[in-house]
């Protein structure tokens, strides 16, 4: 299910990388949040609680990833051409149940300004 | 401070519509709330779940009365609206709207909706 | 549809007593429960969340047990304000369903 367009700045690009932020709401305790370059998953990041509340972070396809507890950010260096794609982050909730998943995206544009090696 | 309140209707007819706003505070359905929900209490009788509408306009109705029930929401407004087609004496109830983070924490006061001819 | 099934459905006891509602659901829902407890003419007011989580401002004698189909919520000690009725509800899964309700008075 495609929940729509993301309604904030998905992609923030700096030193020829590009950060995209992946957003969900403040009291999401466990989730999933992969990253889809089209269809095909290229990041994921779990966030479970175990006994005591400690904390897990895992990685199944392990990206350069950023978390704080309203958005997961995914970092991707060396930009060219070929990443201009349509990219979502699809969000598994587990805590709070019942069990979701959304899905929001955008499209990444690149141009010329904000490739990692312009030719002079 | 989380704080929801219910205004509509106080009494309906048989076969109109009704439709309930809630209005809420302390929280944005934008990003940081999860969702509102609406649940009803007949006289003397016990809770019953209604519908849900999340931040991302995902929205979840009770299979006994999905095809009578709409549930929207107006971010900017900070309101979710529901809206029960057909109305029934057995409809009589408190209306209730509330913040729910998987359980419901936070609750409106409610307002009763007799439907009478 | 996940049925919630209270008991009893209402229960004397005096100042003081000790207080024990079972509520069972038709399925296993982890500790996917709430208590709720509604006073009349008032809304409901949340207490327990994810079956034995007191909610923030809540007596420490509301305490909540139980995983998978049995839960209990009890009261230590109990005070004139806890004379209410108390509701179950699972999380688990939609429709999200509440038991019938206990009804605590006053022996």
């Known amino acids: 299910e495609i929940n729509g367009s993301a309604n904030y700045e998905m992609f923030i690009f700096h030193n020829g990388g590009v950060q995209i932020l992946c957003k969900y709401p403040d009291i999401v305790q466990q989730f999933k949040m992969q990253l889809l370059k089209g269809g095909q998953i290229l990041c994921d990041l779990t966030k479970t609680k175990g006994s005591g509340n400690t904390v897990s972070i895992k990685s199944l396809k392990f990206c350069h990833s950023q978390l704080s507890n309203n958005s997961v950010s995914f970092f991707l260096y060396n930009l060219d051409h070929s990443h201009a794609n349509y990219y979502f982050c699809n969000l598994s909730i587990f805590d709070p149940p019942p069990f979701k998943v959304t899905l929001t995206g955008g499209y990444l544009h690149i141009y010329e300004s904000q490739l990692c090696c312009q030719l002079k | 401070q989380i704080t929801l309140k219910e205004s509509g209707p106080t009494l309906v007819k048989p076969t109109q519509t009704l439709t309930l706003t809630c209005t809420f505070s302390?929280?944005?359905?934008?990003?940081?709330?999860?969702?509102v929900g609406w649940i009803r209490q007949p006289p003397g009788k016990a809770l019953e779940w209604l519908a849900f509408?999340?931040?991302?306009?995902?929205?979840r109705y009770s299979p006994s009365l999905k095809s009578r029930l709409t549930i929207t929401k107006d971010t900017s407004k900070n309101q979710v609206v529901l809206t029960m087609t057909n109305m029934d004496p057995v409809d009589t109830a408190t209306y209730y709207c509330?913040?729910?983070?998987?359980?419901?924490?936070?609750w409106g006061q409610g307002t009763l909706v007799t439907v009478s001819s | 549809d996940i049925q919630m099934t209270q008991s009893p459905s209402s229960l004397s006891a005096s100042v003081g007593d000790r207080v024990t509602i079972t509520c069972r659901a038709s399925?296993?829902?982890?500790?996917?429960l709430a208590w709720y407890q509604q006073k009349p003419e008032k809304a409901p007011k949340s207490l327990i969340y994810?079956?034995?989580s007191l909610q923030s401002g809540v007596p420490s004698r509301f305490s909540g047990s139980g995983s998978g189909t049995d839960f209990t919520l009890t009261i230590s000690s109990l005070q004139p304000e806890d004379f209410a009725t108390y509701y179950c509800?699972?999380?688990?899964?939609?429709?999200?369903?509440f038991g019938g309700g206990t009804k605590v008075e006053i022996k």
């Open positions: 509408i999340y931040w991302d306009d995902d929205k």
């Open positions: 302390g929280f944005s359905l934008g990003t940081s709330g999860l969702g």
């Open positions: 994810a079956a034995s």
């Open positions: 509330a913040h729910r983070r998987g359980f419901f924490d936070y």
């Open positions: 399925q296993g829902i982890s500790s996917w």
């Open positions: 509800q699972q999380y688990n899964s939609y429709p999200l369903t």
